[in-house]
């Protein structure tokens, strides 16, 4: 539920509540859709996306997708619901505060994706091995 003076609506996913019925604030994410990128062979990159958007649904998290093929490199920044696949992949790291890139198998290209749930966390995308989730300190942060 939401404050009593705000009317309730049935079956609407714009409203996300906790067990006490409090309303969840939405995520703020970089949201430039697909842009050409110069990010290559680096431990981490900034998105160079100037648009920070309010995610439409409070359950959405920030997502970044880095793709490289024979012709170009692109970086996609969006909001997305972690309950739904994105580019046919589950957002398994959606609870992470940082956007740690993981390689996914896609024919004909190199494809990395990350998701995260702190404000504008998809602005800084991390490829470095030292940040991968075998790091127990990071796991502590994610699952606290």
């Amino acid at each position: 539920t939401i404050p009593p003076h705000v009317q309730k609506s049935v079956n609407n996913d714009m409203i996300v509540t906790d067990n006490n019925g409090a309303v969840k604030f939405p995520q703020l994410c970089k949201f430039c859709d697909v842009r050409f990128s110069t990010c290559d062979n680096q431990k981490s990159c900034m998105s160079n996306c100037s648009i920070t958007s309010i995610c439409e649904k409070p359950q959405e998290v920030c997502v970044a997708v880095w793709r490289k093929n024979d012709e170009n490199i692109t970086l996609e920044t969006v909001c997305h619901d972690p309950k739904l696949p994105y580019h046919d992949f589950i957002l398994e790291d959606a609870a992470s505060p940082k956007c740690i890139m993981k390689e996914k198998k896609k024919p004909g290209e190199t494809f990395f994706m990350c998701s995260c749930s702190s404000d504008e966390c998809n602005d800084n995308i991390i490829f470095s091995e030292e940040y991968n989730t075998s790091n127990p300190d990071l796991l502590l942060v994610i699952f606290q």
Epitope: T1, I2, P3, P4, H5, T17, D18, N20, G21, A22, V23, K24, F25, L28, I54
Partner: nanobody, 124 residues
């Protein structure tokens, strides 16, 4: 505690403009990220725009970007929403809400976190 009171709603034709205000009583206005949130009849909440307390960095939903402008005057404890190029789909009750640092949820029924709302109707 901060109390929030919105004003400035009304009936406007498509393409028209309105400026909403949210007056906050209390001395802690400058500690909070402030939001404009709307609810169309029978629909859920839509988070429209937000502004930081310091530096006044602003954020918008994609549905209103380029048409709406959020601002705040910390000396007057007031939040504003300038709405231009209004469309029928902007018809809603508009609420202001406050968000403390690292706060992820707004408790239900907390009128110190929510205003009572002001109705905006866009119709010819």
């Amino acid at each position: 505690e901060v109390q929030l009171l919105e004003s400035g709603g009304g009936l406007v034709q498509p393409g028209g403009s309105l400026r909403l205000s949210c007056a906050a009583s209390g001395s802690t206005f400058t500690e909070y990220r402030m939001w404009w949130v709307r609810q169309a009849p029978g629909k859920g909440l839509e988070w429209v725009s937000a502004i930081e307390p310091i530096g006044h960095r602003t954020y918008y939903a994609n549905s209103v970007r380029g048409r709406f402008t959020i601002s705040r005057d910390n000396s007057k404890n007031t939040l504003y929403l300038q709405m231009n190029s209004l469309r029928a789909e902007d018809t809603a009750v508009y609420y202001c809400a406050k968000q403390a640092p690292n706060q992820r949820y707004v408790a239900r029924g907390r009128l110190d976190y929510w205003g009572q709302g002001t109705l905006v109707t866009v119709s010819s």
